[in-house]
Interface confidence: medium
């Protein structure tokens, strides 16, 4: 199988004329050392080819998980899930864009996009590296988390005396602690504006507004629809 034929991610599927959003299976790749992986592909947004790495929309899955679970991934691929840090690391080894889509409880949708996204390996604690921000989600609420390691309730890699993962009830690139908390607690309407450990994006709705829906998705920087 040549590199042109290989299917690495949803953008590869898009280039092979898979143009409908939904669940796909990426085959294993011995050369890259990647196992078979079930992914959700967004083939519509801004030209398509996006591999969804996180989704929050139902609150059916707890995101207050340990390091191993965030490494491997958890949740249900058609519902709420985290794809897994190891998989996300592999998918971001080529130059990659990140798109974060958010919806509030009033039905307004915003997005943030990053020209460059790298998730380092486990040895480097899945440290996050981001390029330039664009979008309409207010102030960049991931900038504060740039160049920080991933932390979970059982692995405190943050830049704080507090254990941010335990305070914010999630797994995330906690600094000291948050400008966003996209893996926080899912609070439903009525509870959504009362907590600091919700699914927050400070640059839009502030520190205690938990969003209704979030999706994080990636695709190669050189992707052409």
């Amino acid at each position: 199988q040549t590199s042109a034929d290989a299917i690495y991610d949803c953008s590869s599927l898009y280039q092979k004329n898979y143009r409908i959003s939904g669940v796909y299976r990426l085959p294993s790749n011995d050369f890259l050392g990647s196992p078979e992986l079930e992914v959700f592909c967004d083939m519509e947004t801004k030209g398509g080819g996006w591999t969804v790495i996180q989704r929050r929309k139902s609150g059916l899955v707890s995101f207050y998980r340990d390091w191993k679970q965030y490494k491997q991934g958890f949740g249900s691929i058609r519902g709420d899930f985290w794809l897994g840090n190891e998989h996300i690391h592999r998918l971001s080894r080529q130059p990659t864009r990140l798109r974060v889509e958010m919806e509030d409880w009033e039905g307004t949708v915003r997005y943030a996009e990053y020209s460059h996204f790298v998730l380092s390996n486990e040895l480097n604690s899945y440290r996050l590296f981001l390029g330039n921000y664009s979008g309409n989600a207010g102030n960049d609420a991931l900038y504060y988390h740039n160049n920080t390691a991933f932390s979970t309730k059982d692995k405190d890699n943050d830049n704080c005396l507090d254990k941010c993962a335990q305070l914010r009830k999630g797994g995330y690139w906690y600094n000291c602690c948050t400008d966003s908390n996209l893996n926080g607690v899912y609070y439903r309407l009525g509870e959504h504006d009362k907590h600091l450990d919700g699914i927050t994006w400070y640059g839009w709705h502030g520190a205690n507004y938990s969003l209704k829906r979030v999706e994080m998705k990636i695709r190669p920087e050189d992707f052409k629809p």
């Epitope: 409908i20 939904g22 669940v23 139902s58 059916l60 899955v61 949740g75 249900s76 519902g79």
Partner: antibody, heavy 120, light 107 residues
């Protein structure tokens, strides 16, 4: 009004291939999130999931029956077809088709079911 | 595969009784669980999805609870039309799996 209806032979011989058709109305298999599944129920026994097909042609099969099953759809005709090869008397059951609508792999609407007996 | 175990397999009760049926998953499925009711000679009918969400048109005497591996279906005050067989189904991942069923009979 949404309806699903199964059709196919009521009697098949061992080793033969069973072909079942699910004809539906009131929804479209081209709508994002929609799937149609097949579930069977042997007499006096529990439900057993067989296969699913989605709007994007994503197909899922029960691992224990995967080698014998094929599911296809004709979106324009609003039908889904399930074929099951090498039929055996243990495959005697009522076969249901049902709609999977949304994000959570459950079935919100079912057909009445069609009984299939496997006997020589 | 995720195994679903229902208990009891059969249950006798009277009209007006409060009835609880349990379902256990062999591994954590968060809240991805559905409950169905089936009457003899009829197709199953969806009662509850996402562990606790009541399907449209289903009477409010039916309720579901649980998360992770242990789930319950409760009928708060049994009505004559509720005597049937009840199945749970995990909707977390394929292959989809059903419980063995609980037959609810008149005492």
């Amino acid at each position: 009004q949404i309806t699903l209806k199964e059709s196919g032979p009521t009697l098949v011989k061992p080793t033969q291939t069973l072909t079942l058709t699910c004809t539906f109305s009131g929804f479209s298999l081209s709508t994002s999130g929609v799937g149609v599944g097949w579930i069977r129920q042997p007499p006096g026994k529990a439900l057993e999931w067989l296969a699913l097909i989605y709007w994007n042609d994503d197909k899922r099969y029960s691992p224990s029956l995967k080698s014998r099953l094929t599911i296809t759809k004709d979106t324009s005709k609003n039908l889904v077809v399930l074929t099951m090869t090498n039929m055996d008397p243990v495959d005697t059951a009522t076969y249901y088709c049902a709609r999977d609508y949304g994000d959570y792999w459950f079935f919100d609407l079912w057909g009445r079911g069609t009984p299939v007996t496997v006997s020589s | 595969d995720i195994q679903m175990t229902q208990s009891p397999s059969s249950l006798s009760a009277s009209v007006g009784d409060r009835v609880t049926i349990t379902c256990r998953a062999s591994q954590g499925i968060s809240s991805y669980l559905a409950w169905y009711q089936q009457k003899p000679g009829k197709a199953p009918k969806l009662l509850i999805y996402a562990a606790s969400s009541l399907q449209s048109g289903v009477p409010s005497r039916f309720s579901g609870s649980g998360s992770g591996t242990d789930f319950t279906l409760t009928i708060s005050s049994l009505q004559p039309e509720d005597f049937a067989t009840y199945y749970c189904q995990q909707s977390f991942s394929t292959p989809l799996t059903f419980g063995g069923g609980t037959k609810l009979e008149i005492k």
